[in-house]
Amino acid sequence: MADNFSLHDALSGSGNPNPQGWPGAWGNQPAGAGGYPGASYPGAYPGQAPPGAYPGQAPPGAYPGAPGAYPGAPAPGVYPGPPSGPGAYPSSGQPSATGAYPATGPYGAPAGPLIVPYNLPLPGGVVPRMLITILGTVKPNANRIALDFQRGNDVAFHFNPRFNENNRRVIVCNTKLDNNWGREERQSVFPFESGKPFKIQVLVEPDHFKVAVNDAHLLQYNHRVKKLNEISKLGISGDIDLTSASYTMI
């Protein structure tokens, strides 16, 4: 179990079986019925309670520090309560399941699903060790999903799963500078399924973005826009129902 690894080890990759350097273990916990690892009810995210239940506490099925569930993660749409108990990451670097704008309307009041397209403000830009988490469900017969890390009118990182490009499923990553798209980076591993829930996590590293989907490392994308502190917004669009979009430091 990853609980034996220190946060430092998890981040540096030293002495752990997780070479991508993600915090904690990824996808090695037996799944609940129909769910992701550690799910507490069918189709749920790790450690997620039914909507609206258990505000601010870890719901049944989410033990502290469970792989795939950040410590004491609240159900999406509720404000987080105190951190979970022993077994969670050290409090100095403890990820919360929600950072800014957790499943809220534009003024910070608790709300239901977010309206897509949705913009997550990043007023201080992005910095290394920042973890952005997006929870949602792919719509049936989906065509595309897009995440756009925006620097003014530029797109520093465009993450674009395409469900049917010439009868193939592919993820395209790119950067747009001065209205011009650069060289595409394509990834054929495609972890999204129409009609199914997903969790996308983007970890900002000094020289690249790391992306994991459903607790499995997917890809990394080297920074083409170097001024990370100027990446001030994350645009989320496409054929999804969006549950929450949030960030924290790890």
Partner: antibody, heavy 114, light 107 residues
Framework: QVQLQQSGPQLVRPGASVKISCKAS????????MHWVKQRPGQGLEWIGM????????RLNQKFKDKATLTVDKSSSTAYMQLSSPTSEDSIVYYC???????WGQGTTLTVSS | DIAMTQSHKFMSTSVGDRVSITCKAS??????VAWYQQKPGQSPKLLIY???TRHTGVPDRFTGSGSGTDYTLTISSVQAEDLALYYC?????????FGGGTKLEIK
């Protein structure tokens, strides 16, 4: 270096709207949110809202939704806050601040008086 | 809204002393906390963000710490120029909210 130059002190009659400006220089104006914060003399700070100059998306504190309107002029790298129907309660200092916010303007003192 | 409480409105100290200013959030703000210094007649200056990251040009006698709901700004050796008002702010969720401020005074 980063500079946020706010408009000077303003005297306004109750009920007449007023617009405060904040001219930015020394950084990429469209790459950072611009915040507005109010402060009563000898009292604490209160966040009014913020605007993304690249597309004018705003996030307002619900408390100020009928009071403040945030706009920008990209061509002059200037942010504006318009206050509607000011009362004596609005006689305070208003700051603009960029980004985190990490740099602040010098403040604009508003006096509402008949 | 998230309330940020600075329990000490005033703190007395002497030059050279170590002082800690505390701030408590009404809910877990996941280290999304900044600290500002404001001197009379001046605008606030950012000292610390993300609870512990020092802003450019801030002397290393200023350090921030904390997690969950409890955050602290520590000045390891107070200088005369540090006498000011100090505010914490959460940037976890809108509306961003500030603490009421702590005024650092000389004994």
């Amino acid at each position: 270096q980063v500079q946020l130059q706010q408009s000077g002190p303003q005297l306004v009659r109750p009920g007449a709207s007023v617009k405060i400006s904040c001219k930015a220089s020394g950084y990429s104006f469209t790459s950072y949110w611009m915040h507005w914060v109010k402060q009563r003399p000898g009292q604490g700070l209160e966040w009014i809202g913020m605007i993304d100059p690249s597309d004018s998306e705003t996030r307002l504190n619900q408390k100020f939704k009928d009071k403040a309107t945030l706009t920008v002029d990209k061509s002059s790298s200037t942010a504006y806050m318009q206050l509607s129907s000011p009362t004596s309660e609005d006689s305070i200092v208003y700051y603009c601040a960029k980004g985190r916010p990490d740099y602040w303007g010098q403040g604009t003192t508003l006096t509402v008086s008949s | 809204d998230i309330a940020m409480t600075q329990s000490h409105k005033f703190m007395s100290t002497s030059v050279g002393d170590r002082v800690s200013i505390t701030c408590k959030a009404s809910q877990d703000v996941s280290t999304a906390v900044a600290w500002y210094q404001q001197k009379p007649g001046q605008s606030p200056k950012l000292l610390i963000y993300w609870a512990s990251t020092r802003h450019t040009g801030v002397p290393d006698r200023f350090t921030g710490s904390g997690s969950g709901t409890d955050y602290t700004l520590t000045i390891s050796s107070v200088q005369a120029e540090d006498l000011a008002l100090y505010y914490c702010q959460q940037h976890y969720n809108t509306p961003y909210t500030f603490g009421g401020g702590t005024k650092l005074e000389i004994k």
